[in-house]
Interface confidence: low
């Protein structure tokens, strides 16, 4: 079986303040089993934006139905973008583990830049 790849096709996305930003992410395989998460930034200080497994993320909606058994599209849309949302977003695949899931592979990242709201 081909090893899973995490594909973030856009290196950068530019959105006007107040609009929604779509950040695309796809997996090439259903294996290994485990959730995906979206983070802003990398390293220890990264900010969790979305966790497929748990949590409440009112500004984030998934582009496709993540609960569907064969789903490979983990794109998200973030509503009401503000300049504070600028940064690089990473789509990260975790491998199911006990007691904790283990980070398996990260996408290359998509840099979100925020333009001033059109007057």
């Amino acid at each position: 079986e081909d090893e899973l790849q995490v594909i973030q096709p856009e290196k950068s996305v530019s959105v006007a303040a107040g609009e929604s930003a779509t950040l695309r992410c796809a997996m090439t395989s259903l294996i290994p089993v485990g959730p995906i998460m979206w983070f802003r930034g990398a390293g220890a200080g990264r900010e969790l934006i979305y966790n497929q497994k748990e949590g409440h993320f009112p500004r984030v909606t998934t582009v496709s139905e993540l609960t569907k058994r064969n789903n490979l599209d983990f794109s998200i849309s973030i509503s009401n973008i503000t300049p504070a949302d600028a940064g690089t977003y990473y789509c990260v695949k975790f491998r199911k583990g006990s007691p904790d899931d283990v980070e398996f592979k990260s996408g290359a990242g998509t840099e979100l830049s925020v333009r001033a709201k059109p007057s």
Epitope: E1, D2, P9, T28, L30
Partner: antibody
Framework: QVQLVQSGAEVKKPGASVKVSCKAS????????MHWVRQAPGQGLEWMGW????????SYAQKFQGRVTMTRDTSISTAYMELSRLRSDDTAVYYC?????????????WGQGTTVTVSS | EIVMTQSPATLSVSPGERATLSCRAS??????LAWYQQKPGQAPRLLIY???TRATGIPARFSGSGSGTEFTLTISSLQSEDFAVYYC?????????FGGGTKVEIK
């Protein structure tokens, strides 16, 4: 190994339809977009469209909009391309081709091609 | 749609020589460009994707370069099995258009 096996050659009359199949093996069928590309005799390659085998979603080149239908049967890992209202200039070899990744960076595995001849 | 123009249409090269093939896009396609090789009666074979990444199993004599609108495929030392038609394809904007091809023939 990873391979795509297409259905055999077809001879059709103008105005008819043709349906070409493409059976995938050796990989997770739902994990890769499938493209269809054609090549008229002595000519170059022409992209027709793609299907996402996972969702069934499609994207067609404007030129074929309304005449082409791409479908799939995940239970048998097979993609289909149907072209209707055939004309003589649809005579070509039709290829299915797998995406390199879930989004398009190239087509790394190709079927052997299916020759479609449209002649009265 | 984005128009891909390949040059030259035909390239006559002796075995062992270097071959340089060009592909130009009518607008920027970033690095979303692939190169394929096709021999008579066969399906195309992916050589290069993302403008410069060699596909699995492709020999190191094949290299791709460029970004934006200008791209080059270089075959450093032509082998007998390299004489074929080469196509570029942009995968940046729908529809994913191909160039018209460059035929590399024996001089």
């Amino acid at each position: 190994q990873v391979q795509l096996v297409q259905s055999g050659a077809e001879v059709k009359k103008p105005g008819a339809s043709v349906k070409v199949s493409c059976k995938a093996s050796g990989y997770t069928f739902t994990g890769y977009y499938m493209h269809w590309v054609r090549q008229a005799p002595g000519q170059g390659l022409e992209w027709m469209g793609w299907i996402n085998p996972n969702s069934g979603g499609t994207s067609y080149a404007q030129k074929f909009q309304g005449r082409v239908t791409m479908t799939r049967d995940t239970s048998i890992s097979t993609a289909y391309m149907e072209l209707s209202r055939l004309r003589s200039d649809d005579t070509a070899v039709y290829y299915c081709a797998r995406d390199t990744y879930a989004y398009s960076y190239g087509m790394d595995v190709w079927g052997q091609g299916t020759t479609v001849t449209v002649s009265s | 749609e984005i128009v891909m123009t390949q040059s030259p249409a035909t390239l006559s090269v002796s075995p062992g020589e270097r071959a340089t093939l060009s592909c130009r896009a009518s607008q920027s396609v970033s690095s979303n460009l692939a190169w394929y090789q096709q021999k008579p009666g066969q399906a195309p074979r992916l050589l290069i994707y993302s403008a410069s990444t060699r596909a699995t199993g492709i020999p190191a004599r094949f290299s791709g370069s460029g970004s934006g609108t200008e791209f080059t495929l270089t075959i450093s030392s032509l082998q007998s099995e390299d004489f074929a038609v080469y196509y570029c394809q942009q995968l940046d904007n729908l529809p994913y258009t191909f160039g018209g091809g460059t035929k590399v023939e024996i001089k």
